[in-house]
């Protein structure tokens, strides 16, 4: 029950996380104009991974996509790539994890197969989350670097007010959405990996049946084969019939010359 709950929760958390990564990638507010110490202006600028926007004080907004691909900064291209890889891996992970869910029965799929699929999707979610966190962090680092470079190039404007030559940009809402979403996807992935351990069958008993000549004779007992401990004895008494065939579970102490292996 706990395994199913962990797996289900991991799936839901990852689903929310990936939805957040998609939302962050599509959002326009990755960087927003820093309004601190800024000349009073009727317009407000903000940029995303795909387009740049200008908003008027009235609320009217005009946006324009980055049409050129080669002219874009390498860092922006890297962030785009990381976010897209995160989304693709996350989407594949979601697809795999749907089939891996313990509460969903698909044909005669064994628990070992479900465990493998759960582990695969968990790893995919972890990598997806890391890609998103890395992408957002690279962009944030770029903003911080540019912010302080702009601050270094200051001059004293009219009225003695210190101004920057360039407009400074600060963290937009998309960065926070991306960080949270990446974190959720990562947590979901870890939960799926934990659930995988509970899904994997820990021991497999192969019941050995031995046949002998006499009904009152003693059966050869190899001991139940255990995946974890090797050969071991089993103390359960389980009588099948009074004839020649007995299970390995039936404890017999004195082997006789009539036993056949």
């Amino acid at each position: 029950m706990a395994v199913t709950a962990c797996q289900g929760l991991g799936f839901v958390v990852s689903l929310i996380g990936i939805a957040g990564i998609i939302a962050a990638t599509c959002m326009d507010q990755w960087s927003t104009q820093d309004l601190y110490n800024n000349p009073v202006t009727a317009v407000f600028n903000y940029q995303g991974l795909w387009r740049s926007c200008v908003r008027e004080s009235s609320g009217f907004t005009e946006c324009r996509g980055y049409f050129t691909l080669l002219g874009l900064p390498a860092m922006l291209q890297a962030v785009r790539a990381l976010m897209i890889v995160g989304i693709v891996l996350g989407a594949i992970g979601l697809l795999v994890s749907i089939f891996a869910l313990k509460c969903i029965r698909i044909g005669s799929m064994e628990d070992s197969a479900k465990a493998n699929m759960t582990l695969t999707s968990g790893i995919m979610f972890i990598v997806s989350g890391l890609c998103a966190i890395a992408g957002v962090s690279v962009f944030a680092n770029m903003l911080v670097t540019n912010f302080w470079m702009s601050t270094a190039n200051m001059y004293t404007g009219m009225g003695g007010m210190v101004q920057t030559v360039q407009t400074r940009y600060t963290f937009g809402a998309a960065l926070f959405v991306g960080w949270v979403a990446g974190g959720l996807t990562l947590i979901g992935g870890v939960m799926m990996c934990i659930a995988c351990r509970g899904l994997a069958p820990e021991e497999t008993n192969y019941k050995a049946v031995s046949y002998h000549a006499s009904g009152h004779s003693v059966a050869y007992k190899p001991g139940g084969f255990k995946a974890s401990t090797g050969f071991g004895s089993n103390t359960k008494n389980k009588k099948i019939y009074d004839g020649g065939a007995r299970t390995e579970d039936e404890v017999q102490s004195y082997p006789s010359k009539h036993d056949y292996v």
Partner: nanobody, 123 residues
Framework: QVQLVESGGGLVQPGGSLRLSCAAS????????MGWFRQAPGKGLEFVAG????????DYADSVKGRFTIARDNSKNTLYLQMNSLRAEDAAVYYC????????????????WGQGTLVTVSS
């Protein structure tokens, strides 16, 4: 990269009008935010007006608001500045500038600049 050439400057009396033009060499003119800056003798660069890609949003310096009008014709790759009710303090070299992503009043945000056209206001 876009090349900008200003024209239309000259001598005008106070209260008069003048129309400046800025022709862009690049056919991707519509993908740039455009601005007009001016520099009076012995002073720094001052923002005059700016306009977004399609002309939907315009921004003006307080000193020119209501007197100057910025406009663009993307089919002709040209930016305009209509200057009315000119004053002595409007005399300066007017520069046309372009940048791809932001409409700001800071000269450092503009990547491409014209050579400038001189506007003289004198009686």
């Amino acid at each position: 990269q876009v090349q900008l050439v200003e024209s239309g400057g000259g001598l005008v009396q106070p209260g008069g009008s003048l129309r400046l033009s800025c022709a862009a060499s690049d056919s991707t003119f519509s993908s740039y935010i455009m601005g007009w800056f001016r520099q009076a003798p012995g002073k720094g660069l001052e923002f005059v007006a700016g306009i977004t890609w399609s002309g939907g949003i315009k921004d003006y310096a307080d000193s020119v608001k209501g007197r100057f009008t910025i406009a663009r014709d993307n089919s002709k790759n040209t930016l305009y500045l209509q200057m009315n009710s000119l004053r002595a303090e409007d005399a300066a070299v007017y520069y046309c500038a372009a940048n791809a992503i932001q409409l700001t009043r800071r000269s450092g945000d503009y990547a491409y600049w014209g050579q400038g056209t001189l506007v003289t206001v004198s009686s």
